[in-house]
Structure formats: C-alpha cells, structure tokens
C-alpha cells in the first residue's frame, strides 16, 4: 500500500500508524482501532475511520426534496464492526447486546432489536444528498462556477469521478450536492460515494481526516464559501424497515 515514502505517513488518513515494515521496507500504514492495513493513495473506508475515531482519545423550487425513505444519521457515533475489506457489517451491536441493521454508510436502517435480529445483506446506499447552507455573502454565487468548483473538489481531493456527482443545485443560501453510484456502476478502484461524503462532511466541520494539510479552503472565483449548516440524507437501494411507531413520531 502506498504512503508518503519520505517520512512514512498516510496522506489520506491521519488516524493511522505507519512504519517501513512493508515488502522491501516500504511504508505501510494501519488504521487505529482495527489495525487493518490501509491504501494511502485513496480514501479510507468510513467504517475503519469511525472505528479509529472511537479508539482515539475523546474530544420556485429547484432544490431536491429528500424522499420519504431518506435516512439521516441521527444516532451519532458508535464503534462499528467492519468486515475484512473495511466495509460495515450489515448487523451492528453495542455492548449491551442491542443490535440493528445498517446500510453501506453505516447508518441504521431498522429498529433496534436484540441478538436474534437478522440482517441478511449489507444494503447499498446509492444516492446521497448533501444539503449545505452557506454564510451570507455580498451576492449569490454563480451556479456554474459553484458546480465546477464542487466537482473539482470531489475529483481532486476525494478522488471521486464527476460522473458520480449527479447534480449540484443552488438556491441561495442552500447548496445541494447529489452523489449517485449504483452497484453496477462502481468499478474496482472507484471511490465509494459514502466515503467521499464522510470525508467532505468532516472537512466542512473543520475536522479534516487528511494528514498534515490545512483545513478545507473552499473558494468560488476567489470568494470564500463558508458553510454554516450541513444535513446529509442517505437513500438505499432497498428502502429501510422501521416500525410505524417511528414513522409517526
């Protein structure tokens, strides 16, 4: 796995321990918490990042209306179980034997149950809607400039191909970025939209996951784009299964 050879660090994940103990003395980096080897030339999976985070010391409408099946991550942080590839296991449980099913971005998609709960497969999140509100500016951003800058950011910083950025919507002060990636579309080596969205979310919050880099400095034609609120909606290939009690709450 590639890493910065000169000082043996992982440019894409600061929550790693790196040492030159790979084949031929190459730099090899392992994620904190799981100890799994990570590929430092691309984004680390969200599951391994969450695990590392939990192990670290504690500290006229053009906009899209999220579908009734859209999930928001209301449960917050938990220490996830990851499979050997670093993906979320379909069933997650806490220390008190409370279990639930998650989607490919680790967001709960069923009611909580006990150890008898079955999660047959990891359901893929194929559509992510990132809803941002930017701070007041002298005037609105030019839509096509904003679109180009966000696509550049996702391509250059997160290595997500522009074909997976389905649309960028803008109605001042709300920006919506739609990421879409079907199972059939995702080729080997393609960054997962869930991982890109998580890195972006952390960047926006000023909690960059990148090693030794300044925070995200988003500018559109030189004008700073400062985000004051972020909401992320997740749509799965199979709708979630919650009881009526939750839906009417």
């Amino acid at each position: 796995h590639t890493a910065a050879q000169d000082n043996c660090t992982c440019p894409t994940n600061k929550m790693t321990v790196c040492s030159p103990d790979g084949p031929g003395g190459r730099c090899q980096c392992r994620a904190l918490g799981s100890g799994m080897a990570v590929d430092c030339s691309t984004l680390t999976s969200k599951c391994l990042l969450l695990k590392a985070r939990m192990s670290a010391p504690k500290n006229a409408r053009t906009l899209v209306r999220p579908s009734e099946h859209a999930l928001v991550d209301n449960d917050g942080l938990y220490d996830p179980d990851c499979d050997p590839e670093g993906r979320f296991k379909a069933r997650q449980c806490n220390q008190t034997s409370v279990c639930w099913c998650v989607n490919s971005v680790g967001v709960r998609r069923t009611d909580k149950g006990d150890l008898s709960l079955r999660c047959d497969e990891l359901v893929r999140t194929h559509h992510i809607l990132i809803d941002l509100r930017h701070r007041p500016t002298a005037g609105a951003f030019n839509h096509s400039d904003l679109d180009a800058e966000l696509r550049r950011l996702f391509r250059e910083r997160y290595r997500l191909h522009p074909k997976f950025v389905a649309a960028v919507h803008y109605e001042q002060p709300t920006i919506q970025i739609e990421l879409r990636q079907n199972t059939s579309q995702k080729a080997a080596g393609d960054v997962d939209i869930g991982d890109a969205a998580y890195y972006f979310e952390r960047d926006i919050k000023g909690e960059s996951l990148f090693q030794g880099r300044g925070g995200l400095d988003l500018r559109v034609r030189g004008e700073p784009l400062q985000v004051e609120r972020t909401l992320i909606y997740y749509l799965d290939e199979i709708p979630p299964k919650f009881s009526m009690k939750r839906l009417t709450a």
Partner: antibody, heavy 118, light 111 residues
Amino acid sequence: QVQLQQSGAELVRPGVSVKISCKGSGYTFTDYSIHWVKQSHAKSLEWIGLISTYYGDATYTQKFKGKATMTVDKSSSTAYMELARLTSEDSAIYYCALLGAYNYFDYWGQGTTLTVSS
Amino acid sequence: DIVLTQSPASLAVSLGQRATISCRASESVDSYGNSFMHWYQQKPGQPPKLLVYRASNLESGIPARFSGSGSRTDFTLTINPVEADDIATYYCQQSYEDPPTFGGGTKLEIK
C-alpha cells in the same frame, strides 16, 4: 489567467531518456492534477496519465507504464514527465493539460515536440 | 477502454454550408443525465481547443455556429454556417471512464 508553459523541443538519440516540464501559473497549482497527452500521426491523441499535485502520486495508462515517469515540484509549480528508452515510436508532440468540471481538457500547454532519431 | 469512432476522416464543405461530424462510442458515456462527451478543434501548430462539453454545452467564447448533440453512444458536432476560420481537425473525447479517450479526428477543408 491560467497558463501552462512547457519546455522546448527535443531532438534525442534512440535509447536515451528525456525529461520535459510543464509550469503552471495563474491558479493554485495544487488544486488541479496535471495530465499528459501524446499526439502522433499514427495514434491521434492519447492520454498518458496524470500526476496529482495534491497527493504527489501518478497514474499511468497500461501502455505507458515503464515508459513515462511523472513527478511534481510544488515549490516551483512545475510538473515533469520523463520518457525512458526512447525509440522512433516516441516521436510526437507531448501536451500537459488541466481538467475542467466534467473531465474535459480545458487548459493545454503549447506542446513539446520530441524527435527521436539517430 | 472506450473506443471512439469518428466519421468522416475528412470533410470538404463550401463556405456558408453545414458541416456535420459524427462520433460513436463503443459503450454509453451517459451518467445521471450527463453525457461525458466533448469536442475540440485543433489548428496546425496549436494545442486542441475545447469547443463543446457535455455533448451540447458551448464553451464560453465559442461562436454559436458550433453546436453539439447526442446521447449515450452517438454524438454529433455541427458547424453551420462554415467559415474559412473553421479549417482545422476536430476531435471528440469521452471522460465517462478512465482512461479518457479521443476519436481519430476529422479534418475539415473548404471546397
């Protein structure tokens, strides 16, 4: 304004290596990867690969692995491409370029003409 | 790799007439309503210049006599009316899949 300034034409012998450069100006250098494209009479335009000015690593098409080596010097905002074990097949114009929003090439260097001849 | 087949290889058109260049991709280059197909003009001694991006969007500063159309695998660049300054070679390029690939080019000449 965005500019990509490439090094001058090269006339070299077969078997040797050559290193061509591409200096970016008028934009934040680490915001855009540098792509390299070969243009020859035989094959029209061919993408060779890219170097991420952000991460510093390079990606090559299968055909150019072992032939091309891309590097970057952030301090001088310059990307380099070295071509090894040159043959007459490598005679071509080599362009550096930047990608636009939908991965089209919207800025190009003026091109470096490479002639390999004994 | 996605193969782009351009036709014709060369085209002679009278000034003021319409020129139509075709580009066929070996597989679809569309994704969620976006066609990742672009067109360039290249004059001798110059690098290629972007004319049309995403199949039908004219790059700023390009005259309106240039237009692009098509989706999935079949795309067309139209120049209407042709002017003397349009003598050049035209290339299509797909960016749906890495590596990006180019068509073989169409050389436009004046009758």
